[in-house]
């Protein structure tokens, strides 16, 4: 079997989680693809995931969550911006493959996000310049929801990884006409 | 094939302004953003800015700010940067570079570059 | 602004060596590091992308690792068209910052 192995990342609360996942090119390009939560004894939980097929460099946005997945370079981008404390957990990038089970990416990620502000900033915490608002658009992409004994992913419930609320914008550099999915509640 | 073909050396005055044209081709110019990069004779590589070729975002480097403008026009596949109020410690070449990512700057570097244009400034 | 810092500054190395050069962030950029070469009088070459990811059509004898705020590019064994000079730059936070730089000459 794989030894599943884990990266950590330990961050204070408000600073910004920014990973990437690599995957193989070819297959994976214009697959979906999505961000999950992995609670102890529980299924996989997914938070986010692309458009299907997944458009290039295009940004989507769920609650605090950004995907963008870069199909010339097999890999995701995954922001998990303003952290909270209840966000600490182990995360996974998968790519969906129906009817298949979702492909998992490696590494998992370990998040520790702990109180108070260091003044140093952490993953990402960008101090720019020029700040644009995401503006409040949607998208017809939806994460499918799988139900194999093994892997389980639904749609982001209102408590899992304290994902905002649709009406939420958050500011990052540059960043118009985002493609932004709606929380389901 | 893809390449950034830009606009030929210049000599300014100090105070003037000068345009440097980027013209892209073998690529979907929209896809990506344009960065600018110059480099000073002898120094190292310094970022002046970024613009979206998809919808003409920018950010400059806070100690240019107030002093170039870059755009685009999608017409032609073509990026421009001004530079105003030119100092003699802005004699450089200047190079632009595409980057992936339509949005956000360039997350995973600058992989296309021009061939550079020369900038003097010299009374 | 992230601070970035190369060292060394300048390395003398024969053909065949294999050459290491690092780059420390002021501050975490996670994986989000570039590594460009450039020789005298030629733009900038992008080599790795994200940290380890190596640019279509670059050599596998470059390579990329780190994560954080500390990061190496190491050239397993160097060729004469690898004398040049090296730059790394974090790509994540506004403004983009480059290294001072690396220069690789012939010993």
């Known amino acids: 079997a794989t030894k599943l192995t884990e990266e950590k990342y330990e961050l204070k609360e408000g600073q910004t989680l920014d990973v990437k996942c690599d995957y193989t090119l070819e297959k994976f390009a214009s697959s979906q693809k999505a961000w999950q939560i992995i609670r102890d004894g529980e299924m996989p939980k997914t938070l986010a995931c692309t458009e299907r097929p997944s458009k290039n460099s295009h940004p989507v946005q769920v609650g605090r969550i950004i995907l963008e997945d870069y199909h010339d370079h097999g890999l995701l981008r995954v922001r998990m911006v303003n952290l909270q404390v209840e966000d600490s957990g182990l995360y996974q990038c998968v790519i969906y493959q129906p009817p298949k089970e979702p492909h998992m990416l490696f590494d998992r990620i370990r998040l520790v996000v702990t109180k108070g502000f260091s003044g140093t900033p952490g993953s990402n915490e960008n101090s720019t310049q020029n700040v644009y608002k995401i503006p409040p658009t949607t998208t017809k992409a939806l994460c499918p929801l799988y139900t194999s004994p093994r892997t389980v992913t639904q749609a982001p419930p209102k408590s899992t990884a304290d994902v905002s609320t649709p009406d939420s914008e958050i500011n990052l550099t540059n960043v118009t006409d985002i493609i932004r999915v709606p929380v389901f509640n | 094939q893809v390449q950034l073909v830009q606009s030929g050396a210049e000599v300014k005055k100090p105070g003037a302004s000068v345009k440097v044209s980027c013209k892209a081709s073998?690529?979907?110019?929209?896809?990506?953003?344009i960065s600018w990069v110059r480099q000073a004779p002898g120094q190292g590589l310094e970022w002046m800015g970024w613009?979206?070729?998809?919808?003409?975002?920018?950010n400059y480097a806070q100690k240019l700010q107030g002093r170039v403008t870059m755009t685009t026009d999608t017409s032609t596949s073509t990026a421009y940067m001004e530079l105003r109020s030119l100092r003699s410690d802005d004699t450089a070449v200047y190079y632009c570079?595409?980057?992936?990512?339509?949005?956000?700057?360039?997350?995973?570097?600058?992989?296309?570059w021009g061939q550079g244009t020369t900038v003097t400034v010299s009374s | 602004d992230i601070q970035m810092t190369q060292s060394p500054s300048s390395v003398s190395a024969s053909v065949g060596d294999r050459v290491t050069i690092t780059c420390r962030a002021s501050?975490?950029?996670?994986?989000?590091l570039a590594w460009y070469q450039q020789k005298p009088g030629k733009a900038p070459k992008l080599l790795i992308y994200?940290?380890?990811n190596l640019q279509s059509g670059v050599p596998s004898r470059f390579s990329g690792s780190g994560s954080g705020t500390d990061f190496t590019l190491t050239i397993s064994s160097l060729q004469p068209e690898d004398f040049a000079t090296y730059y790394c730059q974090q790509a994540t936070a506004h403004p983009p910052t480059f290294g001072g730089g690396t220069k690789v000459e012939i010993k």
């Open positions: 570079a595409r980057g992936a990512g339509m949005y956000d700057g360039s997350p995973l570097g600058m992989d296309v």
């Open positions: 613009i979206s070729a998809y919808n003409g975002n920018t």
């Open positions: 073998g690529y979907t110019f929209t896809s990506y953003g």
């Open positions: 501050q975490g950029i996670s994986s989000w």
């Open positions: 994200a940290a380890s």
